[in-house]
């Protein structure tokens, strides 16, 4: 058993049929010695009396908020949560496996630039009785500070018969140099509680590997005289690291017809303009990627040809 | 993804082309190592990230763009000084910091060159003949060093009398290639920045 927060304890249980469970001794936080009674989850049933209460925790029915009272007055609380271990593996029931980029990916993170700011998100099908806490650091043996905000519900989606909820959190490395060469990864730890079930999830990455620039901005077309060609121009996204001559991007320009089956013409360039043939009813899209370190491409910025 | 091949203009900062070739070569070599050594811990997640130039050169600090010198997190240590007579210094107005930056890059290349050559000698003794260093990568390192043209004492190639542990050597190769790729990215950024200035 270990303390998660003040008056909140996690009992780690090997989860299998007829498991013996864990014996837990609760102590009432009071100088009083006599006339103390214990209840669970505001039940009127008295579980025991005295300054300590010994319980055998085997299942979720044994977890919950234990309260000690004296003469109708509440003295203290202890909330017991369960962390299940099945076949030597901690349970991952609360979050959904996103399976991208690989199996057992529960947390996904992205950064728009090298400032040390990043966003992580996760999915669940659970709608209520859910709370999260996020901690992060650079490295684990001698951790350097990363500050994370509160996790918030960022999207709701319908997937077949199920509703899916996306939570996200923003974190910022306390003293980040955009030009630094990372040798220690960022560690992200998410604590999750659903009802009386506790789980924790972790992710480890270098900012350079989770970079995904915003799409190029101010995408414009300029028709060239007496030609089906147009000059496409765009700018670096505002959120990209500066100076741009140091943090350079490369671009992919795509001409796509109305039908998805039509052949796509693609051009790669390091410049912020390109000349392409604009077909009728086609659209021109441009996306960006770090020029020197191949992490993710941005989403497309698009304009119609007409 | 292969990086786009840049054809340098005659007046272009002379080292940019070489640094782009360097990044392409090390990226290809790293990809080849990860494929060939698929049963070795050779991915970014599996290896220990070591920097053989740590405490010996200060490329990131010495080559910091002017715009980032206001960022206190970027200014850890800037006291290293090097020889200052490189041929990449196209402009007369080249600052002392730029010379320091380029000489730091030169020192990095020299250290990696020695490490790679020593390692290649060991890998050539491996009866499995599983992996060798790409001669193109070694040549590109050499070309960039020549373009930087700093006078520096030659570092003798390390020789080892004991029987090489080929497993350890291959893991060290992965560690070295990952680190060198990261440094090659920095070098490319620096050359791009200096070219734009």
């Amino acid at each position: 058993i270990w303390e998660l927060k003040k008056d909140v304890y996690v009992v780690e249980l090997d989860w299998y049929p007829d498991a013996p469970g864990e014996m837990v001794v609760l102590t009432c936080d009071t100088p009083e010695e006599d006339g103390i009674t214990w209840t669970l989850d505001q039940s009127s049933e008295v579980l025991g009396s005295g300054k300590t209460l010994t319980i055998q925790v085997k299942e979720f029915g044994d977890a919950g908020q234990y309260t000690c009272h004296k003469g109708g007055e509440v003295l203290s609380h202890s909330l017991l949560l369960l962390h299940k271990k099945e076949d030597g593996i901690w349970s991952t029931d609360i979050l959904k496996d996103q399976k991208e980029p690989k199996n057992k990916t529960f947390l996904r993170c992205e950064a728009k630039n090298y400032s040390g700011r990043f966003t992580c998100w996760w999915l669940t099908t659970i709608s209520t009785d859910l709370t999260f806490s996020v901690k992060s650091s650079r490295g684990s043996s001698d951790p350097q500070g990363v500050t994370c905000g509160a996790a918030t519900l960022s999207a709701e989606r319908v997937r077949g018969d199920n509703k899916e909820y996306e939570y996200s959190v923003e974190c910022q490395e306390d003293s980040a140099c955009p030009a630094a060469e990372e040798s220690l990864p960022i560690e992200v730890m998410v604590d999750a509680v659903h009802k009386l079930k506790y789980e924790n999830y972790t992710s480890s990455f270098f900012i350079r590997d989770i970079i995904k620039p915003d799409p190029p901005k101010n995408l414009q077309l300029k028709p060239l005289k007496n030609s089906r060609q147009v000059e496409v121009s765009w700018e670096y996204p505002d959120t990209w690291s500066t100076p741009h001559s140091y943090f350079s991007l490369t671009f992919c320009v795509q001409v796509q017809g109305k039908s998805k089956r039509e052949k796509k013409d693609r051009v790669f360039t390091d410049k912020t303009s390109a000349t392409v043939i604009c077909r009728k009813n086609a659209s021109i899209s441009v996306r960006a990627q770090d020029r020197y370190y191949s992490s993710s491409w941005s989403e497309w910025a698009s304009v119609p040809c007409s | 993804r292969n990086l786009p091949v840049a054809t340098p203009d005659p007046g272009m900062f002379p080292c940019l082309h070489h640094s782009q070739n360097l990044l392409r070569a090390v990226s290809n070599m790293l990809q080849k190592a990860r494929q060939t050594l698929e049963f070795y811990p050779c991915t970014s997640e599996e290896i220990d990230h070591e920097d053989i130039t740590k405490d010996k050169t200060s490329t990131v600090e010495a080559c910091l763009p002017l715009e980032l010198t206001k960022n206190e997190s970027c200014l850890n240590s800037r006291e290293t000084s090097f020889i200052t007579n490189g041929s990449c210094l196209a402009s007369r107005k080249t600052s002392f910091m730029m010379a320091l930056c380029l000489s730091s890059i030169y020192e990095d290349l020299k250290m990696y060159q020695v490490e790679f050559k020593t390692m290649n000698a060991k890998l050539l003794m491996d009866p499995k003949r599983q992996i060798f260093l790409d001669q193109n990568m070694l040549a590109v390192i050499d070309e960039l060093m020549q373009a930087l043209n700093f006078n520096s004492e030659t570092v003798p190639q390390k020789s080892s009398l004991e029987e090489p542990d080929f497993y350890k050597t291959k893991i060290k190769l992965c560690i070295l290639l990952h680190a060198f790729r990261i440094r090659a990215v920095t070098i490319d950024r620096v050359m791009s920045y200096l070219n734009a200035s």
């Epitope: 927060k5 505001q42 919950g64 909330l79 009785d129 859910l130 709370t131 009802k195 009386l196 | -």
Partner: nanobody, 120 residues
Framework: EVQLVESGGGLVQPGGSLRLSCVAS????????MAWYRQGTGKQRELVAS???????SYQDSVKGRFTISRDNAENTVYLQMNSLKPEDTAVYHC??????????????WGQGTQVTVSS
């Protein structure tokens, strides 16, 4: 901050029925238990019924067999179905929620109360 709003109180004759509702809104986190308390004029507040996060109900002896507590998890609502009401059930009924926020810790919230009067 968790807000609780009770409704469903009113004047009813002895033997009659009422259904109280309490909706929790705001930053709820994980609810560990929901309960109904009551306070008659000049009396101490007393626990009437509670329901654990696992749905286990508990009742004060005087209401057993007459009152039923239930919870709609999806709506964060707790109900108290009161049948065979007696004059001694007259009181202000308060909703109570206890829960956990991992960022801030344990919390307890109370509703303003809804008046139940049993009289002929």
């Amino acid at each position: 901050e968790v807000q609780l709003v009770e409704s469903g109180g009113g004047l009813v004759q002895p033997g009659g029925s009422l259904r109280l509702s309490c909706v929790a809104s705001g930053s709820i986190g994980s609810i560990t238990s929901m309960a109904w308390y009551r306070q008659g004029t000049g009396k101490q507040r007393e626990l009437v019924a509670s329901i654990s996060s696992g749905g286990r109900p508990s009742y004060q002896d005087s209401v057993k067999g007459r009152f039923t507590i239930s919870r709609d998890n999806a709506e964060n609502t707790v109900y108290l179905q009161m049948n065979s009401l007696k004059p001694e059930d007259t009181a202000v009924y308060h909703c109570n929620v206890r829960g956990l926020h991992l960022d801030t810790g344990l919390y307890e919230s109370w509703g303003q109360g809804t008046q139940v009067t049993v009289s002929s």
